[in-house]
Interface confidence: low
């Protein structure tokens, strides 16, 4: 009991003057508070509190539930306490079965004893199962048993308070431990799509998925550089223990161009925060932009292959694509595919595969594409490079030798004379006339060149070579001369 010092207020005195009292069930509890400034008695056990304004607390027939702390308080706010155990062989434990523990913190299994003289006050697993090896506890007969540093693995652990009474083990009602997880990482946030492209009037709806260990994670949609509160709808699920998922859906029922911008899904817990963004672009109408992947003017050698490739952006999705040549639509030889398999993809590729091109297949190849809002096209001019072909080589009635050659690019015709004994023609002969015959004809295809020389200049037996060439190759034709006296006896053209 507290001692009294004159001049300063002292705590009340309690009779009997003990810190603890053991009473048998059914007997009387009589406690007297001695203090000139008595105010009240207070009784506390588990979550129960009772008050009494009489200075003598009397319980005529004590029950196990009268076990607890009795505190007397005076007008100075000073108090003294006595703890009363009501020994009841039929009720060794008082229990509050709600048991929650925060991960990494201590938690109290509230099973105070009604008899302090029992032994082996401890925790036991239900149905004889052992407790987790790393579970540590501290018993206190007046409060219960404290589990130290609760682990997430203890969630849903079933246990009893236990004590030995007169040589027999007695178990309390069972407790189920519910562990509230500690946040040890930031929430995991994700959005249904990273970007959205819409036309005016279309609905914008985006879902943010927030994953964390418990539902106390905070989340919200925000518009960057704006304080406006956005309207969200929520769905949530517990996928087993410590696996909580929330879906926060943001909707703008009729999007406008000025709704374009960056929207952030933000989530935080006591560990930290995380966010993810999605970009909304609202356009007043759809579009198509075409980008050639090769030069739109193409030169290709006769017999070779060429691929005409375009990339294009189309929104909404392209509905019709075609490749056209000379007013004819290709039904095969081309493919069209999305550049990416991402749902928000608006970029596509179209390839026309031209194989073993002939000199006659030069021309304009056009790619056309349309969607519900617009159409667009791009043209490729394809030139087929061909080796010169000598179309005619003749001696004209006026004594001229004439060579006509066709090819692309435009062939050049050179003339050579070789004496009868020479195998190689090297002496060049200047033409008297050179003409490009179809310069004003169609823009694609072979160009025809005509060149003439005067055969009267040749006084000896020999051979004249007409050589037509361009970047692709060369072709020759030959004229043989034989003189008899002063007359040219024959001129034999051959290739």
């Amino acid at each position: 009991q507290p001692s009294v010092s004159p001049g300063e207020p002292s705590p009340p005195s309690i009779h009997p003057a003990k810190s603890e009292l053991i009473v048998r069930v059914g007997n009387e509890i009589r406690l007297l508070c001695i203090d000139p400034g008595f105010v009240k008695w207070t009784f506390e056990i588990l979550d129960e509190t009772n008050e009494n304004k009489q200075n003598e607390w009397i319980t005529e027939k004590a029950e196990a539930t009268n076990t607890g702390k009795y505190t007397c308080t005076n007008k100075h706010g000073l108090s003294s306490s006595i703890y009363v155990f009501v020994r009841d062989p039929a009720k060794l434990f008082l229990v509050d079965r709600s048991l929650y523990g925060k991960e990494d913190n201590d938690t109290l299994v509230r099973c105070p004893l009604t008899d302090p003289e029992v032994t082996s006050y401890s925790l036991k697993g239900c149905q004889g199962k052992p407790l987790p090896k790393d579970l540590r506890f501290v018993p206190d007969p007046k409060a219960g048993i404290t589990i130290k540093s609760v682990k997430r693995a203890y969630h849903r652990l079933c246990l009893h308070c236990s004590a030995d009474q007169e040589g027999k083990s007695v178990l309390s009602d069972k407790f189920i431990l519910k562990v509230r997880p500690a946040f040890k990482a930031v929430p995991v946030v994700s959005v249904s799509k990273a970007s959205y492209l819409l036309r005016e009037g279309e609905e914008f709806t985006v879902t943010c998925t927030i994953k964390d260990v418990s539902s106390s994670v905070y989340s919200t949609w925000k518009r960057e550089n704006s304080q406006t509160k956005l309207q969200e709808k929520y769905n949530s699920w517990h996928h087993g223990d410590f696996n909580y998922e929330r879906q926060a859906t943001l909707t703008i029922s009729s999007a406008r161009v000025n709704d374009s911008g960056v929207f952030m899904c933000y989530a935080n817990n006591t560990f930290g925060s995380a966010n993810v963004t999605t970009t909304l672009e609202v356009v007043d109408k759809g579009f198509i932009n075409i980008f050639p992947m090769i030069n739109t003017t193409v030169f290709v050698n006769d017999g070779e292959n060429v691929d005409l490739i375009v990339e294009y952006e189309a929104f909404p999705k392209p509905e019709h694509q075609q490749w056209i040549y000379m007013n004819r639509t290709f039904t095969d030889k081309w493919e069209d595919y999305p550049k990416s398999e991402n749902e928000s993809n608006i970029r596509y590729v179209s390839e026309l595969h031209l194989t073993r091109l002939k000199g006659t297949e030069g021309g304009t190849y056009t790619f056309l594409v349309s969607n519900s809002d617009v159409n667009a096209s791009i043209a490729f001019n394809v030139y087929v490079n061909t080796k010169p072909e000598i179309l005619t080589y003749d001696r004209l009635v006026n004594g001229m030798l004439q060579c006509v050659a066709a090819g692309f690019p435009e062939p050049t015709i050179d003339w050579y004379f070789c004496p009868g004994t020479e195998q190689r023609c090297s002496a060049s002969v200047l033409p008297v006339d050179v003409q490009t015959l179809n310069a004003s004809g169609p823009p694609f295809g072979k160009l025809v060149v005509q060149s003439s020389i005067d055969s009267s200049a040749f006084k000896h037996n020999g051979t004249v070579e007409c050589k037509a060439y361009n970047d692709v190759g060369k072709t020759s034709a030959y004229f043989n001369f034989a003189f008899k006296g002063n007359n040219k006896e024959q001129i034999h053209p051959h290739t």
Epitope: V188, S190, V191, S192, K193, A194, T209, W237, H239, V276, T278, S340, E341, N342, E343, S344
Partner: antibody
Framework: EVQLVESGGGLVQPGGSLRLSCAAS????????MAWVRQAPGKGLEWVAN????????YYLDSVRGRFTISRDNAKNSLYLQMNSLRAEDTAVYYC???????????????WGQGTTVTVSS | EIVMTQSPATLSLSPGERATLSCRAS??????LNWYQQKPGQAPRLLIY???RLQSGIPARFSGSGSGTDYTLTISSLEPEDFAVYYC????????FGGGTKVEIK
Amino acid sequence: EVQLVESGGGLVQPGGSLRLSCAASGFTFSDYYMAWVRQAPGKGLEWVANINQIAGSTYYLDSVRGRFTISRDNAKNSLYLQMNSLRAEDTAVYYCARGDYYGTTYWYFDVWGQGTTVTVSS
Amino acid sequence: EIVMTQSPATLSLSPGERATLSCRASQDISNYLNWYQQKPGQAPRLLIYYTSRLQSGIPARFSGSGSGTDYTLTISSLEPEDFAVYYCQQGKKLWSFGGGTKVEIK
């Protein structure tokens, strides 16, 4: 318990067809991306096809595009792979896998079935 | 197509040793990298996603790091059950796996 069980594998001649099925249980099937991944004998893993959980968008490995079709029936908690014009190089164990996500459109495969064997041989 | 290259093809180590497995992408994959473990006759198992995030239920001896095109899986102290084939997988553009690294007992 989250579980994926594949079926429908077997021996088929080149040019033939097979339909693989994957039965899902223990989770809300319609909430997840699903995929087929294959593994040729003694070789590594090769992603084959994916199907999105919302719009049913499909994605394919280039070498199977036009021959294989991935589909799903959310009401039956089932994923399918229709394989036509099969070739010897399609011989593999085919795994059904669940896609979970992190970030924006980035996915990983967090649950796998035990696989079903497809052998293409004459 | 993004090509994933793993090295070495085989790693011979003893239990208790540290294992370092490499994975290189043919282009920047923005940390969109996952690691899987596969034992003979079993399906692959996800270990790590988004370069360094440990999948639930995976022991803390597994860790991942890297950025850009170069990524690493580290097993701090090999346990007998860790001897298996490990695959990396990118999720930046469609999905492709590396050829695998076999971790075998020395």
